[in-house]
């Protein structure tokens, strides 16, 4: 529930990106469980790939949707699929891959003065007067108007890491996901587990920069698991 | 243009309950967590909980658990903040605030609650 | 809980002057403080978000600075409708919180 993740200080992993290794910046921070984002981290590779279970897209990748793997399949049983490329068919537009959305049940190009939920500076920054547009940001539907090419600052409300300028990723903090600094040398990471728990996940850290991986700290190779410190280091 | 209507101001006896509304129009309610602060005469803000109107889920500062209870109706778009056991210290003005980010950018006028015997 | 501390409390300047609030969190914050400005008897309105960022319609003679505990509130040059109470708010860690206020005045 919001109330146990949002009462919760765990900060939990990041993902690697598909295919690569973790710390990887072009990896993007997946979206935890709790208050706007639910979902937890996954870890694939492409010759070792394992479904990943799901309840909401927000779960899955930036290229993934979450739905039943077979048509008229167990609603109970969803992993996470591949997005549907264009001219596609398609129920919704998180099942369009980024660039696209949803249309008339065919997956079209955003660029035709469409945005699919991709939040950029531009919106952020045009919040409006005096509650004109709340937060500037719809969270689940399409924006419509022009198209944006400002990639978001840091602070800035964000769906995923392509949402922001380079040197930032798109993290959770609250019941919020903003633009957050990469993480550099030396800087306190988290570090992803592949098996066991998805715990939750209120606040996240980016992931190591380019040439940096988390592990451990040399220094904290004594200490219990639960307490390691790991640390983004050369590789 | 977001707009954030409370309910009218309210006089309890210390013991009693209140409950305050919040009509929300302009935007699309479930896409958009609502947070209650309140602000007790000359005292700093104060955050209560917050809740996502999409699927119910809650969350509460410590400080109040057990006596507030935050809802929604979606089809009036409407949120609720009730607040139990009321004493003397609970009067203050009560805000809804509905927001994306970790800040509070949209906000109701505010609603006087006083506790008085 | 985090605790928030602004100084000074209250201050009184002329039209024109450069005004500045401080503002203190117990622990570090990183960049997440947010400023509001509250008129007698209205809602507070988000002036600046994540430390710096002008929100949107927001006056440029209002910025912020600072990172950690530490952290600054400023007026370029006071304008008359520029009397209100200022808050700072933390976000870094649940529950977010206030600041006691700074309540800005003309001399």
């Known amino acids: 529930t919001l109330n146990s993740v949002l009462n919760s200080n765990a900060i939990k992993n990041l993902p690697p990106p598909l295919g690569g290794a973790a710390g990887h910046p072009g990896s993007a921070v997946s979206a935890a469980p709790g208050i706007l984002y639910p979902g937890g981290n996954k870890y694939q590779t492409i010759d070792n790939y394992q479904p990943y279970p799901c309840a909401e897209d927000e779960e899955c990748g930036t290229d993934e949707y979450c739905a039943s793997p077979t048509r008229g399949g167990d609603a109970g049983v969803q992993i996470c699929l591949a997005c549907r490329k264009r001219r596609k068919r398609c129920m919704r537009h998180a099942m369009c891959c980024p660039g696209n959305y949803c249309k008339n049940g065919i997956c079209v190009s955003s660029d035709q003065n469409h945005f699919r939920g991709e939040i950029e500076e531009t919106i952020t920054e045009s919040f409006g007067n005096d509650h004109s547009t709340l937060d500037g940001y719809s969270r689940r539907t399409t924006l419509s108007s022009k198209m944006y090419h400002t990639k978001g600052q840091e602070g800035s409300v964000c769906l995923r890491s392509s949402d922001c300028a380079s040197g930032l990723c798109c993290a959770r903090h609250f019941w919020s996901k903003i633009c957050k600094p990469v993480l550099k040398e030396g800087q306190v990471c988290t570090k992803h587990r592949r098996k066991g728990s998805h715990g939750l996940e209120i606040f996240q850290r980016c992931y190591c920069g380019e040439g940096l991986s988390c592990r451990i700290q040399k220094d904290h190779h004594q200490a219990s698991n639960s307490s390691r410190l790991h640390t983004c280091q050369r590789h | 243009q977001v707009q954030l209507v409370q309910s009218g101001a309210e006089v309890k006896k210390p013991g009693a309950s209140v409950k305050v509304s919040c009509k929300a129009s302009?935007?699309?309610?479930?896409?958009?967590?609502m947070h209650w602060v309140r602000q007790a005469p000359g005292q700093r803000l104060e955050w209560m909980g917050v809740?996502?109107?999409?699927?119910?889920?809650?969350s509460y500062n410590q400080k109040f658990k057990g006596r507030v209870t935050i809802t929604v109706d979606k089809s009036s778009s409407t949120a609720y903040m009730e607040l139990s056991s009321l004493r003397s210290e609970d009067t203050a003005v009560y805000y809804c605030?509905?927001?994306?980010?970790?800040?509070?950018?949209?906000w109701g006028q505010g609603t006087l609650v006083t506790v008085s015997s | 809980d985090i605790q928030m501390t602004q100084s000074p409390s209250s201050l009184s300047a002329s039209v024109g002057d450069r005004v500045t609030i401080t503002c203190r969190a117990s622990?570090?914050?990183?960049?997440?403080l947010n400023w509001y400005q509250q008129k007698p008897g209205k809602a507070p309105k988000l002036l600046i978000y994540y430390k710096s960022r002008l929100h949107s319609g927001v006056p440029s003679r209002f910025s912020g600075s600072g990172s950690g505990t530490d952290f600054t509130f400023t007026i370029s040059s006071l304008q008359p409708e520029d009397i209100a109470t200022y808050y700072c708010?933390?976000?870094?860690?649940?529950?977010?919180?206030f600041g006691q206020g700074t309540k800005l005045e003309i001399k």
């Open positions: 708010q933390q976000v870094h860690t649940l529950p977010p919180t």
């Open positions: 622990q570090d914050i990183s960049n997440y």
């Open positions: 302009g935007y699309t309610f479930t896409e958009y967590t």
């Open positions: 605030s509905s927001t994306t980010g970790p800040w509070f950018a949209s």
């Open positions: 809740i996502d109107p999409s699927n119910g889920d809650t």
